[in-house]
């Protein structure tokens, strides 16, 4: 900045207008004032400035608002939102759902998933509610963004949103996220019965506890192996052979193809081989007959 040239005489603009189109980049840098841009954001958007010119304007705004843009400016950003990075957005404080919806509309179809997600996370952080309208405004963005929210932000997500989540959406979720989402899904689908309930809840079963899985095994759900593989290891290893047999039903045969992969392998290690043999699938890796299993977690508690 020490090298920055001075604004040539008569070039200081008093308003945002089309004449700025003719300015050299260094003239924009030298002459344009960030507060003026913020006041006339509508014109910044309307006048066909080039991307290069807009990036200079952004630099000006960033210098004017080093702590992040005020909400009054964020509300007016319009198309300019496209030039803002997720890192910028994390500095913001957004409380108005209308601001979020307006900006999500701008970002639609613009390869701006990261910005859209950052914006919603920022809104949730400020105590906002992610409603179905907002999820719809997020449009085609896979709901995997739920896994990007902090656990605190997730608390603000209404249970009704769980109806929109698909199986691939939770692939990258942490165990903590899955647990929270599972709880929300349980309350979202509480009035759904039978097989339809299982169809809906199975996306979230990665967050289910051993107790939940035991309860589920009583309902002849015939869980497919893909869903079984998504269960968390800690919950799975607590299930007996009989419980897994009930849980998988006719799909129990698919365990054989997965016996050397986690989490099936982890579960096999915790079962007695004689119980596995009763399945007649040739599953290996169980505890040999006559061996005693010591639970070191329990022993540590007494030492």
């Amino acid at each position: 900045d020490a090298e920055q040239k001075a604004c040539p005489p008569g070039k200081e603009p008093y308003k945002v207008d089309e004449d700025l189109i003719f300015y050299q980049n260094w003239e924009l840098e030298a002459c344009v004032d960030g507060t003026m841009l913020a006041r006339q954001m509508d014109l910044v958007n309307e006048i066909p400035f080039t991307y290069e010119q807009l990036s200079i304007f952004k630099h000006k705004l960033d210098k004017t608002y080093p702590q992040g843009y005020p909400e009054s400016l964020i509300q007016q950003l319009g198309h300019f939102f496209r030039y803002v990075s997720p890192e910028d957005i994390h500095q913001w404080n957004v409380t108005s759902p209308d601001t979020v919806k307006t900006l999500l509309k701008v970002s639609k179809g613009q390869k701006m998933n990261a910005q859209a997600i950052a914006l919603v996370a920022c809104y949730l952080r400020g105590g906002g509610q992610l409603d179905e309208d907002m999820v719809k405004a997020l449009g085609d963005i896979p709901l995997s963004y739920l896994c990007d929210f902090s656990p605190q932000d997730l608390h603000s997500v209404p249970s009704s949103v769980m109806w929109l989540v698909g199986p691939q959406d939770l692939d990258k979720c942490s165990q903590r996220h899955l647990g929270l989402l599972y709880q929300k899904a349980c309350s979202a689908f509480q009035n759904v019965s039978g097989l339809e309930y299982f169809e809906k809840i199975k996306t979230f079963l990665g967050g289910a506890s051993v107790k939940d899985l035991r309860a589920l095994s009583q309902h002849n759900v015939s869980m497919d192996i893909a869903t079984f593989k998504r269960l968390q290891v800690d919950s799975l290893v607590g299930l007996s052979v009989a419980e897994v047999q009930k849980l998988l039903g006719p799909n129990i045969v698919d365990l054989k193809t997965e016996e050397d992969k986690s989490p099936v392998r982890d579960w096999l290690f915790r079962q007695h081989q004689k119980d596995l043999d009763r399945l007649g699938l040739g599953l290996q890796g169980g505890i040999p007959n006559g061996y005693l299993v010591l639970d070191f977690n329990v022993r540590e508690a007494f030492s």
Partner: antibody, heavy 119, light 111 residues
Framework: QVQLVQSGAEVKKPGASVKVSCKAS????????INWVRQAPGQGLEWMGI????????KYAQKFQGRVTMTRDTSISTAYMELSSLRSEDTAVYYC????????????WGQGTLVTVSS | DIVLTQPPSVSGAPGQRVTISCSGS????????VSWYQQLPGTAPKLLIY???QRPSGVPDRFSGSKSGTSASLAITGLQSEDEADYYC???????????FGGGTKLTVLG
């Protein structure tokens, strides 16, 4: 009423230059930018650049950068477009067009000037 | 150097409705207004639609413009023989600060 009247047809040799004029009337000349657009025979429209008559600032399409010069004479409300190093592909009708503030469109056009480049 | 894509020609019988499409990108149509120009044979272009869907005074309401994302279209209803002309879509391009045109569409009114 607003009018843009252009100079007459020109025939030029390859390598030469041509200067087309566009005289504005019916409005404040310095209050609206002037654009230049050309159209080769049987082809589409092609934007060449824009001049702000108030200060004389210009902005040219990359394709014409270095070969085109746009100027104006405010005393006679006239804009000029000079194209140098002419080649046969520059044979076209050259139009001046007024840019309408706030809508960024060309609301009035000159009648066109045919420039033929031929050896 | 054509940045906006239009069909080379369309045709329709008198009284019919035709549409002309114009496809661009996020740097032009996606972030700026679209205008349409009509060029009758042997004359200078004339503004037909501006700001995506606005008609200048004097342009019949048979002409209408619309835009969605990075595409725009011009619709002409109740076709008349005097509509036979070339139609150009255009927009500013934010990538290099130039004004871009479509390649033009020749409208033929049949019969």
């Amino acid at each position: 009423q607003v009018q843009l009247v252009q100079s007459g047809a020109e025939v030029k040799k390859p390598g030469a230059s041509v200067k087309v004029s566009c005289k504005a009337s019916g409005y404040t000349f310095t209050g609206n930018y002037i654009n230049w657009v050309r159209q080769a025979p049987g082809q589409g429209l092609e934007w060449m650049g824009i001049i702000n008559p108030h200060g004389g600032d210009t902005k040219y399409a990359q394709k014409f950068q270095g070969r085109v010069t746009m100027t104006r004479d405010t005393s006679i409300s006239t804009a000029y477009m000079e194209l140098s190093s002419l080649r046969s592909e520059d044979t076209a009708v050259y139009y001046c067009a007024r840019w309408h503030h706030g809508t960024w469109i060309f609301d009035y056009w000159g009648q066109g000037t045919l420039v033929t480049v031929s050896s | 150097d054509i940045v906006l894509t239009q069909p080379p020609s369309v045709s329709g019988a008198p009284g019919q409705r035709v549409t002309i499409s114009c496809s661009g990108s996020s740097s032009n149509i996606g972030s700026n207004y679209v205008s349409w120009y009509q060029q009758l044979p042997g004359t200078a272009p004339k503004l037909l639609i501006y700001n995506d869907n606005q008609r200048p005074s004097g342009v019949p309401d048979r002409f209408s413009g619309s835009k969605s994302g990075t595409s725009a279209s011009l619709a002409i209803t109740g076709l008349q023989s005097e509509d036979e002309a070339d139609y150009y879509c255009s927009s500013w391009d934010r990538a290099d600060g130039s004004y871009v045109f479509g390649g033009g569409t020749k409208l033929t009114v049949l019969g």
